[in-house]
Interface confidence: low
């Protein structure tokens, strides 16, 4: 289902599509267009992912511009402000709603954007936790292709003092072509930490084909989340995780 | 002045291949969107194929599978790779700029495909 | 996909005449009409964009109205110059869709 009005109120059946009107061509000038999404059960979460093929006046955003709000309306949590040719992060809202407002000025156009909407699931049982010597970590699925709307978190936890090696046999996902170099995995991404997830220091981000090589873990804890959107499905990733112990805790033995 | 400039037409047979040019001059190429509209012998305007400033491509049913639309924006050119031509794709093709609407047009050029 | 349809298909005129064309939208389409002129062997040009608005360098005897599904091209005082065809056009959504045209013909 596509919606291309210029505002609407979606109480979400299925997934389906807003896009600012005429998209994928030049949409119009000064319009201010309003569109609530409204999950069906108090209870769930949106998530809505922008179509890579994103294109609105850049200028700082003061005169072509789509806002997201995290509830029924402009006075919503704030969740960003975008313009340019970079397509936005995927957002998943805190509740039942999200309010997106979209104004364009009276000159200077582009092809606009287009935003997919769902009902946001968390993977199936994704999570794992390993406290094992050695290990393998796959991507659900794996080598199958992964599904879509994926939030997994893989923690590995061993004694202090000791080395997790982590090393990827296998990693394919949906690459961001987007330059610089492809830096942003706004679409599918591995997040990995030396350490619990945004706690310890940030290792890398991942994506695409280009394996992330050889990782090393001195605090006891690696941590990776895998996040999907919706659209787009690769292998995804197997890596092998080994415990080294180290000089000090050999001293313990 | 903005221009666009039409070449690449011709007699070809059905099943046979053709590379459409559009050469644009007067503007700032990158920042358009661009379209291929054709229009058959005494016919209407039919949109055919657009692609996006950033390099997205759409296409008309009617030619999905067969017509590649392209851009170089270094050279400042559009092109449209017709293959598996029909008779049906006789026309006159014109390679437009989509600003508000399809703001700007050129001059046309004439594909015929008959055996 | 979204179904333009013109009419008349001709008519005939003097200069000087008011001239009224019709276009209808098989789906709602806002205000996102274009209308395009085109004279024999040449390529069309824009007149009217987002139903009402007059492209740059256009005469302003064109004019546009509507919103929805019915819109409407005047031209308030033919000239000899407005003998052509007149195409309607939605970029409401893709595929992008022309009416059939009018074709303005000398009485």
């Known amino acids: 289902f596509r919606n291309d009005k210029c505002g609407d109120t979606i109480k979400i059946e299925s997934p389906g599509y807003l896009t600012s009107p005429g998209y994928p061509h030049s949409y119009h000038p000064s319009e201010k267009c309003e569109w609530l999404i409204q999950a069906p059960d108090p209870y769930q979460r949106i998530m809505i992912n922008f179509n890579p093929h994103f294109d609105l006046e850049d200028r700082d955003c003061k005169y072509d511009y789509v806002e997201v709000f995290d509830g029924e309306n402009e006075n919503g949590h704030f969740r960003g402000k975008f313009c340019g040719k970079i397509a936005p992060p995927p957002v998943v809202s805190s509740g039942p709603f999200l309010f997106i407002k979209f104004v364009s000025d009276y000159e200077t156009h582009g092809a606009g954007f287009s935003i997919r909407y769902e009902i946001f699931k968390r993977g199936p049982e994704c999570s794992q936790n390993y406290t094992t010597p050695s290990g393998v970590i796959k991507s659900p699925g794996f080598p199958e292709k992964y599904p879509n709307s994926l939030e997994c978190t893989y923690i590995v936890f061993v004694p202090k003092m000791s080395e997790i090696i982590l090393e990827f046999e296998s990693f394919d996902l949906e690459p961001d072509s987007n330059p610089p170099g492809g830096m942003f995995c706004r679409y599918d991404r591995l997040e990995i930490w030396d350490g619990f997830p945004d706690v310890g220091p940030h290792i890398g981000r991942y994506c695409g084909q280009k394996t992330p090589g050889r990782i090393r873990s001195s605090s006891g804890i690696l941590s990776m989340v895998f996040y999907t959107d919706s659209a787009i499905a690769k292998e995804g990733f197997s890596a092998n995780y080994s415990v080294l112990q180290s000089s000090v805790s050999e001293d313990f033995k | 002045e903005v221009q666009l400039l039409e070449s690449g037409g011709g007699l070809v047979k059905p099943g046979g291949s053709l590379r459409l040019s559009c050469a644009a001059s007067?503007?700032?190429?990158?920042?358009?969107?661009m379209s291929w509209v054709r229009q058959a012998p005494g016919k209407g305007l039919e949109w055919v194929s657009s692609?996006?400033?950033?390099?997205?491509?759409y296409y008309a049913e009617s030619v999905k599978g067969r017509f590649t639309i392209s851009r170089d924006d270094s050279k400042n050119t559009l092109y449209l790779q017709m293959n598996s031509l029909k008779t049906e794709d006789t026309a006159v093709y014109y390679c437009?700029?989509?600003?508000?609407?399809?703001?700007?047009w050129g001059q046309g050029t004439l594909v015929t495909v008959s055996s | 996909d979204i179904q333009m349809t013109q009419s008349p298909s001709s008519l005939s005129a003097s200069v000087g005449d008011r001239v009224t064309i019709t276009c209808r939208a098989s789906?709602?389409?806002?205000?996102?009409l274009n209308w395009y002129q085109q004279k024999p062997g040449k390529a069309p040009k824009l007149l009217i964009y987002?139903?009402?608005s007059l492209q740059s360098g256009v005469p302003s005897r064109f004019s546009g109205s509507g919103s929805g599904t019915d819109f409407t091209l005047t031209i308030s005082s033919l000239q000899p110059e407005d003998f052509a065809t007149y195409y309607c056009q939605q970029s409401y959504s893709t595929p992008l869709t022309f009416g059939g045209g009018t074709k303005v013909e000398i009485k």
């Open positions: 987002a139903a009402s």
């Open positions: 007067g503007f700032t190429f990158s920042s358009y969107a």
């Open positions: 692609i996006s400033r950033t390099g997205y491509t």
């Open positions: 789906q709602s389409i806002s205000s996102y």
């Open positions: 437009a700029r989509v600003g508000t609407a399809f703001d700007y």
